[in-house]
């Protein structure tokens, strides 16, 4: 049966071949593959200023393949399309558009931004943050006690982090002045010796508005162990009025 | 949008022609093999017949086969089923749709009934 | 002609279930397969195509499965929006055949 389908093949195309290649079912010198074995694809190879038949198991980059009842051939994707399952539904784009619904567009739609890793278009994701925490105690240089106007700060933290077009987050920091009833410090919540506080300059890289570190008292009583000379004190209290500042961070 | 609106349905005897016509918009319509899937009341569905991009070559299903003809206007952007010799079990909905390995898009369909 | 042929042919389930339908081809079909989702007086719509491919706005809870001649649609978790008609199709070969259907109901 083969055979006499090879003659009358043979009739129509002087130079068909019985010893073709591959998968070819029928082919001819010049032309090469003009039908397929079972199951593989034909396609036309563009070979310097003719077209080639040949027979594949899968169609090559940019075609797809499509079973009909006398031929399985390679279909060509859209222009812009790189791989697809069919001519509806592209699976990956040419350089310079983006996969959406299955289509290549060279500029994703309203709502959408453009992922260039994936290259393809994706929703816009938006900051989100959780609800404040509580305030925190109210402190002046880490201490809860000897003084009467200090800080407290809450924290929130960022649930979702925004893609490259949402909405940048909020702060997620908040500092504000507060006022405690004075209360004197007991004896294990001793300030650093003076020495120690006498630190003047901020470290490098340290901001001048930054609440102060070290360890400095307003108790109503004086103990010996907390006494100052009256000039540091004043001065000390200039200092701290200054320095009182709300800081957010913004991320 | 892709819409494919279909028409020309309705009660005809048994033995007798109908033509069905599906209106393509939203793609272009040249490009793409089209097909008719009918689906008998209560059942599941059916291919009946394709037609390539440009007109070149059909494909039925065995049971319409020298009864039905596809063909298609790419000018107006228009499918056709010519019914021919209809019989009481061709009685179902009839859709036309895009036909690429899977049938990707649908019209609503339009009811055919077979009935002396 | 391959047949297709599905199971069950209909199926009762609660929102929340998960649920799976099965598909049946008499020849080794590849992964030629797709599945289709109709609901009453309506076009079907597809949803997967090459056994697993998802169409795009296609819920992440379809999925599909196997190859050859035996492959699932599972559903994980079932909305009130998937009760309708399934449809198994082949397009390994023509004619490009339909399984019967499966009908997923509400309990």
């Known amino acids: 049966q083969n055979a006499s389908r090879g003659r009358r093949q043979r009739r129509m195309h002087p130079n068909v071949s019985q010893g073709c290649q591959g998968g070819c079912a029928t082919c001819s010198d010049y032309n090469g593959c003009l039908s397929c074995k079972p199951r593989l694809f034909f396609a036309l190879e563009r070979i310097g200023m003719k077209q080639i038949g040949v027979c594949l198991s899968s169609c090559p980059s940019g075609y797809y393949g499509t079973r009909y009842p006398d031929i399985n051939k390679c279909t060509k994707c859209k222009a812009d399309c790189d791989t697809c399952f069919n001519k509806n539904f592209c699976t990956k784009c040419k350089s310079g558009f983006y996969l959406h619904l299955g289509k290549c567009l060279d500029n994703c739609p309203e709502g959408l931004e453009a992922n260039n890793h994936t290259m393809e278009c994706v929703s816009i994701v938006h900051c989100e943050v959780s609800e404040w925490n509580p305030w925190s105690p109210c402190t002046k240089k880490g201490k809860t006690c000897g003084f009467k106007r200090g800080t407290e700060t809450r924290v929130r933290e960022i649930i979702q982090h925004p893609s490259a077009k949402g909405n940048l987050c909020p702060p997620t920091n908040e500092t504000r002045k507060c006022t405690v009833q004075r209360k004197k410090c007991q004896k294990g919540e001793r300030g650093k010796k003076g020495r120690e506080r006498k630190r003047k300059k901020p470290n490098k890289g340290e901001s001048k508005e930054a609440i102060p570190d070290s360890k400095s008292l307003e108790s109503s009583k004086e103990i010996p162990e907390q006494r100052e000379n009256k000039q540091q004190q004043k001065k000390r209290k200039v200092q701290d009025k200054q320095k009182s500042v709300s800081v957010s961070t913004v991320h | 949008e892709v819409q494919l609106v279909e028409s020309g349905g309705g009660v005809v005897q048994p033995g007798r022609s109908l033509r069905l016509s599906c209106a393509a918009s939203g793609f272009t319509f040249s490009d793409y093999d089209m097909a008719w899937v009918r689906q008998a009341p209560g059942k599941g569905l059916e291919w009946v017949a394709t037609?390539?991009?440009?007109?070149?070559?059909?494909y039925y299903r065995d049971s319409v086969k020298g009864r039905f003809t596809i063909s298609r206007d790419n000018s107006k952007n228009t499918l056709y089923l010519q019914m021919n010799s209809l019989r009481a079990e061709d009685t179902a909905v009839y859709y036309c749709?895009?036909?690429?390995?899977?049938?990707?898009?649908w019209g609503q369909g339009t009811m055919v009934t077979v009935s002396s | 002609d391959i047949q297709m042929t599905q199971s069950p042919s209909s199926l009762s389930a609660s929102v929340g279930d998960r649920v799976t339908i099965t598909c049946r081809a008499s020849e080794d079909i590849y992964s030629d397969l797709a599945w289709y989702q109709q609901k009453p007086g309506k076009s079907p719509k597809l949803l997967i195509y090459?056994?697993?491919s998802l169409i795009h706005g296609v819920p992440s809870r379809f999925s599909g499965s196997g190859s050859g001649t035996d492959f699932t649609l599972t559903i994980s978790s079932l909305q009130p929006e998937d009760f309708a008609t399934y449809f198994c199709q082949q397009y390994d070969n023509y004619p490009n055949t339909f399984g019967q259907g499966t009908k997923l109901e509400i309990k």
């Open positions: 090459d056994v697993n």
């Open positions: 749709a895009t036909h690429d390995k899977t049938f990707d898009y």
């Open positions: 037609i390539i991009y440009d007109g070149s070559r059909t």
